[in-house]
Amino acid sequence: EVEKTACPSGKKAREIDESLIFYKKWELEACVDAALLATQMDRVNAIPFTYEQLDVLKHKLDELYPQGYPESVIQHLGYLFLKMSPEDIRKWNVTSLETLKALLEVNKGHEMSPQVATLIDRFVKGRGQLDKDTLDTLTAFYPGYLCSLSPEELSSVPPSSIWAVRPQDLDTCDPRQLDVLYPKARLAFQNMNGSEYFVKIQSFLGGAPTEDLKALSQQNVSMDLATFMKLRTDAVLPLTVAEVQKLLGPHVEGLKAEERHRPVRDWILRQRQDDLDTLGLGLQGGIPNGYLVLDLSMQEALS
């Protein structure tokens, strides 16, 4: 048997082209110079290499760059990116948004893989913060990206970046995440007029405190029930019946359908039944007339 480690005569690759698809795997390994491959990475995606052949090419790059690929190679990886492990990606230093976009494009339409998550993590850490352009890019590819971050990570999002956030980007955020994002959104949109402000701030309201909800109730915003149901329970409880009525406007009728669910259920328990009756919705469960309500939390604060 011929020892299959040396490149056969006349098979040395002069450039990365279509002729290589009929090279055996061992011939690719023996006949394609890794440095040539690195400089012509952009050509690889145009050539229908098999899955196995791509593994050979990756192996060649790994041997050439044991400490991690340079960005000039990373930017042109294309489908070869799908072969990278999180361990490979942790060795990279990706600073260009164009590189990030190029690699996210390869994974487009698929869920965020461990590779993509690692890539984004490396990129954001390298930049020091989630700037607007980065957030724009990430949420365009992965609408749920923002809600995958911890509250600590979200704290590095500058208020200016909030302009890139769309309502659907916040669909899977939990209250802890909205607690961090809401003050940033409030700051970002502070110069907008009433109705425009409400449109922008609406999806962040799951992080709003009571005083902000009270202020909104004075602005005829007509909050829909879906938004109301996502509000923090502790922020809703202190609202009076009149304030909730003003906050919801014509949508107040929807309270009846939600009376068994939080935060409506808990809010009802805190209201005087007399006050609830003024809504004419048949809401039951309020404090019976003649009962005295002691706010023990206020008493504790005073003592």
């Epitope: 048997e1 480690t5 009929f22 055996k24 795997k25 011939e27 196995e52």
Partner: antibody, heavy 122, light 110 residues
Framework: QSQLVESGGGRVQPGGSLRLSCAVS????????MGWVRQAPGKCLEYIGY???????YYASWAKGRFTISKDNSKNTVYLQMNSLRAEDTATYFC????????????????WGQGTQVTVSS | ALQMTQSPSSLSARVGDRVTIKCQAS??????LAWYQQKPGKPPKFLIY???DLASGVPSRFSGSGSGRDFTLTISSLQPEDFATYYC????????????FGCGTKVTVL
């Protein structure tokens, strides 16, 4: 003289797992690809998958997820982990070496082990 | 997905006959084809690689030809020890395929 000896076969209940081993001698696993092929009684040869010299693995579409090939170069052994076994997995399981010293499956399989019988039934 | 089709599935012949077995790939595989011989209760034996190159120790009465999609294994003068099942195998792409082997051609005594 290259030799391959399979072991680990036997009877297993549906839904069970089994790990087959293929002990090799006469060559190094760091230079050759190693594959697994099975054959049900009276049926065709059925490719399961292979592992290259650098450890990358490739599988038949039907084997992905249930079957896993691995190797330990220092022990000169290749493994086939089989999970969620079904009656239709009953067969003789062969391990085979890639014939080419290039380390990938480029030319075919040669030599082959004698095979180990796996029976899946309750 | 890449598939291999062998024909005929069985054939009967006499000692001394010239026997031809065909194998077709569903897409071009260049010359990345191997042939095997298998006898009952034994593992397959490697006969031919690269569609036409004889493996070590294989008698010269065996020959292979073809490229692209269509391939042929020929036994020029059938010997008693050649009665067996013959399989082709594509080695162009071994990932995520249903099977790399054809389903065999059984050669029996007429």
């Amino acid at each position: 003289q290259s030799q391959l000896v399979e072991s680990g076969g036997g009877r297993v209940q549906p839904g069970g797992s089994l790990r087959l081993s293929c002990a090799v001698s006469g060559f190094s696993l760091s230079s050759y690809a190693m594959g697994w092929v099975r054959q049900a009684p009276g049926k065709c040869l059925e490719y399961i998958g292979y592992i290259s010299k650098i450890g990358t693995t490739y599988y038949a579409s039907w084997a992905k997820g249930r079957f896993t090939i691995s190797k330990d170069n220092s022990k000169n052994t290749v493994y086939l982990q089989m999970n969620s076994l079904r009656a239709e997995d009953t067969a003789t399981y062969f391990c085979a070496r890639g014939s080419s010293s290039g380390g990938y499956l480029d030319d075919g399989f040669d030599p082959w082990g004698q095979g180990t019988q796996v029976t899946v039934s309750s | 997905a890449l598939q291999m089709t062998q024909s005929p599935s069985s054939l009967s012949a006499r000692v001394g006959d010239r026997v031809t077995i065909k194998c077709q790939a569903s897409q071009s595989i260049s010359n990345y084809l191997a042939w095997y011989q298998q006898k009952p209760g034994k593992p397959p034996k490697f006969l031919i690689y690269d569609a036409s190159d004889l493996a070590s120790g294989v008698p010269s009465r065996f020959s292979g030809s073809g490229s692209g999609r269509d391939f042929t294994l020929t036994i020029s003068s059938l010997q008693p020890e050649d009665f067996a099942t013959y399989y082709c195998q594509q080695v162009y792409d071994s990932n995520n395929v249903e099977n790399v082997f054809g389903c065999g051609t059984k050669v029996t005594v007429l």
